[in-house]
Amino acid sequence: AITEAREEAKPYPLFPGPFPGSLQTDHTPLLSLPHASGYQPALMFSPTQPGRPHTGNVAIPQVTSVESKPLPPLAFKHTVGHIILSEHKGVKFNCSISVPNIYQDTTISWWKDGKELLGAHHAITQFYPDDEVTAIIASFSITSVQRSDNGSYICKMKINNEEIVSDPIYIEVQGLPHFTKQPESMNVTRNTAFNLTCQAVGPPEPVNIFWVQNSSRVNEQPEKSPSVLTVPGLTEMAVFSCEAHNDKGLTVSKGVQINIKAIPSPPTEVSIRNSTAHSILISWVPGFDGYSPFRNCSIQVKEADPLSNGSVMIFNTSALPHLYQIKQLQALANYSIGVSCMNEIGWSAVSPWILASTTEGAPSVAPLNVTVFLNESSDNVDIRWMKPPTKQQDGELVGYRISHVWQSAGISKELLEEVGQNGSRARISVQVHNATCTVRIAAVTRGGVGPFSDPVKIFIPAHGWVDYAPSSTPAPGNADPVLII
């Protein structure tokens, strides 16, 4: 049977303690036993059968006395079975046993919930020898109990390879409710129901839960822990907490903010990181995400030229890393650029528009209608062409580069000529006779050299041959033209 000794009880102390079988909570003995002088334990009171040793784990010594009487069985004396006290209070409890003096080196160990208590515990063992027996009292004290001290404590003693075990002493530390699960902050969709959970434990039980939303109690009557609150939906941010009540009082959980997911704020600080002729690298600072992670972003690009048709190019990209290279742009052009990002709720407004320009680029097309003539009288090759369309010059034309390759009998020689931007014709000297001259022309801007035109070949005969017709850029798909005179 378990007896309860409550901290509130103030039993009449028979004698000042501590004594074998005594218990102290807050240094007030709840059960004290008398003793004779010399600390020899007298009768030990048991909650069930006063004066009888307990019938638990007993060792029966095999040694007999001079008169050959067998020694009585060894057992721990009864003590209080159940101690209930408040957190942070002090408690002291003990085990006592009387051991015949024939046994040497007896030690008592304390165990809690099946594990030996070692080290930094306030355990004291005192010995009170008499003629035939030694009374051993093992005391265990805790100065400021915590919940972790809850449990079942026992004493163990080894004698003659026998283990003697005391009855358990149950320590129950009571206090304010302790949260094992508190509501968590959440981001929720507007007007959509969601759940919050709150769980708290004693002792003492039961623990009752009240929910609070924005300082108003949601349930006017308590709900047993654990409690799940179904919030029927919110239209604006709210703060929730739960109150846990037991007989010791109340504990309030942390307040958690429940946010309403919304469309993000527009990105800010859109800036140009780098410009080339056909691309612009931009970065931006994302706006507030509206309590929902960004999914992707959209870059909107429109020509700033007032004469343009105002069409908008849209480039979609991932939300990270807040960087995007806009490609396929025209060179030397002005653009307005805006960025918008989306989360699960929708798209943000567009950021403030910024102006950006592409740089000059190398022309994107070659000169057109390249024609090559041999002027034998002056021993020159005349070249004519048409300049590429202005739109495709990708910059201000600064001139042309002419490549002419001379091939004859295993010899090949390439020469380059630079021509000013004004002309659309050039004359080059014949380098080798009885050879093929292959001519290609590229337009040049400050942005670089554009692509070369398709090759035009002309055969340069030995001296004294007749005049001949010009050679021209081939129509698409034709083989390289070679004019043989």
Epitope: S216, V218, E220, Q221, P232
Partner: antibody, heavy 118, light 106 residues
Framework: QIQLVQSGSELKKPGASVKVSCKAS????????MNWVRQAPGQGLEWMGW????????TYADDFKGRFVFSLDTSVSTAYLQISSLKAEDTAVYFC???????????WGQGTLVTVSS | EIVLTQSPDFQSVTPKEKVTITCRAS?????MHWYQQKPDQSPKLLIK???NLASGVPSRFSGSGSGTDFTLTINSLEAEDAATYYC?????????FGQGTKLEIK
């Protein structure tokens, strides 16, 4: 299913007392608070207050402090409204209604007409 | 205490029409509940917590709003919807009801 059944109509003289009952069934009586709502003839609804069926503690709206008493007999899952020193202006239909979270009144009694007339 | 003002006080409507009843609170509230009361009957919960349909209520009823302005909407009115409608706030004690809106079917 959940039901709230109220006692029948009462005709009382000014100065007398009346006790209206509201018997609940179909749920655990002590889980939900019991409210009382008054509706004077041709008028709207007025919340009188509620009683905590778990602790027995009553809460009264300001206009109903004094002559109005809420009480319980949990053994028979019944809530009571007692009005003392009746006046003519107490003539009304009195409803009991339960609420849970967020104080919406999901279940109502059928109403009890209390007529105060000399 | 929070005062709830419903408008209109009275409305006469033909079947299949759309009806909107508004409830304005004297200060911000967390939720608004709506009830329907027919003559000589108890009130019946229609909408709980601003926008949630109570069980067994036809889907032609809906609720919306936040802060101080809330709305009960009846799409395609039916003859059986003739009743008085009340709003009730949650968020500040004491609980209060609106004065009611009487709906008559022409």
């Amino acid at each position: 299913q959940i039901q709230l059944v109220q006692s029948g109509s009462e005709l009382k003289k000014p100065g007398a007392s009346v006790k209206v009952s509201c018997k609940a069934s179909g749920y655990t009586f002590t889980n939900y608070g019991m409210n009382w709502v008054r509706q004077a003839p041709g008028q709207g609804l007025e919340w009188m207050g509620w009683i905590n069926t778990y602790t027995g503690e009553p809460t009264y709206a300001d206009d109903f402090k004094g002559r109005f008493v809420f009480s319980l007999d949990t053994s028979v899952s019944t809530a009571y409204l007692q009005i003392s020193s009746l006046k003519a202006e107490d003539t009304a239909v009195y409803f009991c209604a339960t609420y849970g979270h967020y104080a919406w009144f999901a279940y109502w009694g059928q109403g009890t007409l209390v007529t105060v007339s000399s | 205490e929070i005062v709830l003002t419903q408008s209109p006080d009275f409305q006469s409507v033909t079947p299949k029409e759309k009806v909107t009843i508004t409830c304005r609170a004297s200060s911000s509230v967390s939720y608004m509940h709506w009830y329907q009361q027919k003559p000589d009957q108890s009130p019946k919960l229609l909408i709980k917590a601003t926008s949630n349909l109570a069980s067994g209520v036809p889907s032609r009823f809906s609720g919306s709003g936040s802060g101080t302005d809330f709305t009960l909407t009846i799409n395609s009115l039916e003859a059986e919807d003739a009743a008085t409608y009340y709003c009730q706030q949650w968020g500040t004690k004491p609980l209060t009801f609106g004065q009611g809106t009487k709906l008559e079917i022409k």
